[in-house]
Interface confidence: low
């Protein structure tokens, strides 16, 4: 039996059709196609809601870039 076979895996079957303001986003994680039917990005909002988004959409890519820069910038 593979390691962590019982670890929950999250997949996306549908994507949000609404652009989410980057100010409402706290983090994201990528979902790879080997585990799921579709490649996806799951954004976690500041109220801890998880939302599936299409990584091919420009706003999704821009939001990921923004969050990446946020994590690289040390908080004062």
């Amino acid at each position: 039996q593979p390691d962590a076979i019982n670890a929950p895996v999250t997949c996306c079957y549908n994507f949000t059709n609404r652009k989410i303001s980057v100010q409402r986003l706290a983090s994201y994680r990528r979902i790879t196609s080997s585990k799921c039917p579709k490649e996806a990005v799951i954004f976690k909002t500041i109220v801890a809601k998880e939302i599936c988004a299409d990584p091919k959409q420009k706003w999704v890519q821009d939001s990921m870039d923004h969050l990446d820069k946020q994590t690289q910038t040390p908080k004062t």
Partner: nanobody, 123 residues
Framework: EVQLVESGGGLVQAGGSLRLSCAAS????????MDWFRQAPGKEREFVAA????????YYADSVKGRFTISRDNAKNTVYLQMNSLKPEDTAVYYC????????????????WGQGTQVTVSS
């Protein structure tokens, strides 16, 4: 808690067929969308097919489309994977999984897994 037990695996020649079964016990089976995954030696677990709990909608990985068919029998608490035109690259341990709650935006978490059944396709 849901218990899932797979069966139907075995050794088959390329081009042959197998039908896998996944029997569920525990909570109401019809409350769950059901999925098949597979894991080949040294490789990552891979999505194969899914069937919804409500309308029987099905989803397939590109690698199995047209060859594999997922179905379910809620009266028997069982989900099936009919595998035709098998190829050596289909060799793997096949696992069924029960989907937990899904979010409005389509995120799905797999809460329960079976122990797996070995499928070996020889050339």
């Amino acid at each position: 808690e849901v218990q899932l037990v797979e069966s139907g695996g075995g050794l088959v020649q390329a081009g042959g067929s197998l039908r896998l079964s996944c029997a569920a016990s525990g909570r109401t089976f019809s409350n769950y969308a059901m999925d098949w995954f597979r894991q080949a030696p040294g490789k990552e677990r891979e999505f194969v097919a899914a069937i919804s709990k409500s309308d029987g909608s099905t989803y397939y990985a590109d690698s199995v489309k047209g060859r594999f068919t997922i179905s379910r029998d809620n009266a028997k608490n069982t989900v099936y994977l009919q595998m035709n035109s098998l190829k050596p690259e289909d060799t793997a341990v096949y696992y069924c999984a029960a989907e937990g709650d899904s979010s409005p935006m389509g995120g799905v978490t797999y809460d329960y897994w079976g122990q797996g059944t070995q499928v070996t396709v020889s050339s």
